[in-house]
Amino acid sequence: TLNSVLINSNAIKNLPPPLGGAGGQPGSAVSVAPGVLYEGGNKYQTLDNYQPYPCAEDEECGSDEYCSSPSRGAAGVGGVQICLACRKRRKRCMRHAMCCPGNYCKNGICMPSDHSHFPRGEIEESIIENLGNDHNAAAGDGYPRRTTLTSKIYHTKGQEGSVCLRSSDCAAGLCCARHFWSKICKPVLKEGQVCTKHKRKGSHGLEIFQRCYCGEGLACRIQKDHHQASNSSRLHTCQRH
């Protein structure tokens, strides 16, 4: 139900519930143990059996997905929206999020966003913001400072806790994940850390936090000593392939 919220954050790691909360729509932004679904009252259960990721916006989808009506490319076209696979290079697009990581939407086509090959003045404003990291600050003289475009752009990738638009904005070892009404860079999960196994059956639309994915060489699997537990309480952790 959309009145449920899945708390699922790198930030929280293995805290006992609760961290405290405040109201949210849909549902209440209640901070409970990671990977636990709050359904009002005292009822907690994990989410592992929903149909394809329902979503309302791109940030609820994975880094290789965007939110859209399944029959049309653009989000916001009537009916239910789900997370769809990103568009590869040279495919049609309407916004940056539709293009796969490493690409951006230019003139309705997904183009490679090789930071060192942007011609002067060619990058759209939102890309300039990302590359210049200007979304992280106000200038010292009290006025915001825009990044000046040169033919080569060198920038610092977002560190943990930095606001981001997609994972390519974040430094190595971090991904861009939903955090309440924003997205921030969070650590890619290490071996043994709790992860979220969505099984392509959706819960992104209910998350107010997202965890990152498991790091290289790791997969999100049921923790061995939890095999005997009921389906609704299986704990997934990042494990070696």
């Epitope: 930030a11 309302a56 916006e57 638009l165």
Partner: antibody, heavy 115, light 108 residues
Framework: QVQLVESGGGLVQPGGSLRLSCAAS????????MTWVRQAPGKGLEWVSG????????YYADSVKGRFTISRDNSKNTLYLQMNSLRAEDTAVYYC????????WGQGTLVTVSS | DIVLTQSPATLSLSPGERATLSCRAS???????LAWYQQKPGQAPRLLIY???NRATGVPARFSGSGSGTDFTLTISSLEPEDFAVYYC?????????FGQGTKVEIK
């Protein structure tokens, strides 16, 4: 450059309503979550509400839940805060700010609730 | 709610001196989801530090943030006349977002 300009503040009686607006420019508005923060005269900062880039997700402080409604019109690059059932303790300067740590702030608009 | 306690409430220093402001969280933040702001009278706050230690664009290098867990620090290495203001910390780990009560840095 990024600019946020609030408007709509003023004097209102207890129980009354006001609608604050925040006009945004200089950035891709729908890419960013937005936040309202308030500051009572001579006091510290208090988070009021937040809204995701598309407007699909909203969050409120307990002190305003059920009375205030945050919304946005991405076609107009404008953020709103509808304030109903106002109380004396809602008297404050209200700031709109971008994202969850507030990287850009408006100049603020004063809301005075008094009879 | 996570309570942030800033100390001292007031710091009286001279230009050129080093200022060390503390922000203590009532719960372990585990992650560096802490920001620092500067506010001058009659003005909106201004972001200085985010992610506990990342300096916001355009913020002078004399400002630095550090700390983790429950204890965070904002350091101004050598105070300039324009640095005398109120400083707030804010956590964005969990809701409600909370701010410290502020530290006023005043001229001695």
């Amino acid at each position: 450059q990024v600019q946020l300009v609030e408007s709509g503040g003023g004097l209102v009686q207890p129980g009354g309503s006001l609608r604050l607006s925040c006009a945004a420019s200089g950035f891709t508005f729908n890419n960013y979550g937005m936040t309202w923060v308030r500051q009572a005269p001579g006091k510290g900062l208090e988070w009021v509400s937040g809204i995701s880039g598309s407007g699909s997700y909203t969050y409120y402080a307990d002190s305003v839940k059920g009375r205030f409604t945050i919304s946005r019109d991405n076609s107009k690059n404008t953020l709103y805060l509808q304030m109903n059932s106002l109380r004396a303790e809602d008297t404050a300067v209200y700031y709109c700010a971008r994202t969850i740590y507030m990287d850009y702030w408006g100049q603020g608009t004063l809301v005075t609730v008094s009879s | 709610d996570i309570v942030l306690t800033q100390s001292p409430a007031t710091l009286s220093l001279s230009p050129g001196e080093r200022a060390t402001l503390s922000c203590r969280a009532s719960q372990n933040l585990f992650s560096p989801y802490l920001a620092w702001y500067q506010q001058k009278p009659g003005q909106a706050p201004r972001l200085l530090i985010y992610g506990a230690s990342n300096r916001a664009t355009g913020v002078p290098a004399r400002f630095s943030g550090s700390g983790s867990g429950t204890d965070f620090t904002l350091t101004i290495s050598s105070l300039e006349p324009e640095d005398f203001a109120v400083y707030y910390c804010q956590q964005y780990l969990t809701l409600p977002l909370t701010f410290g009560q502020g530290t006023k840095v005043e001229i001695k």
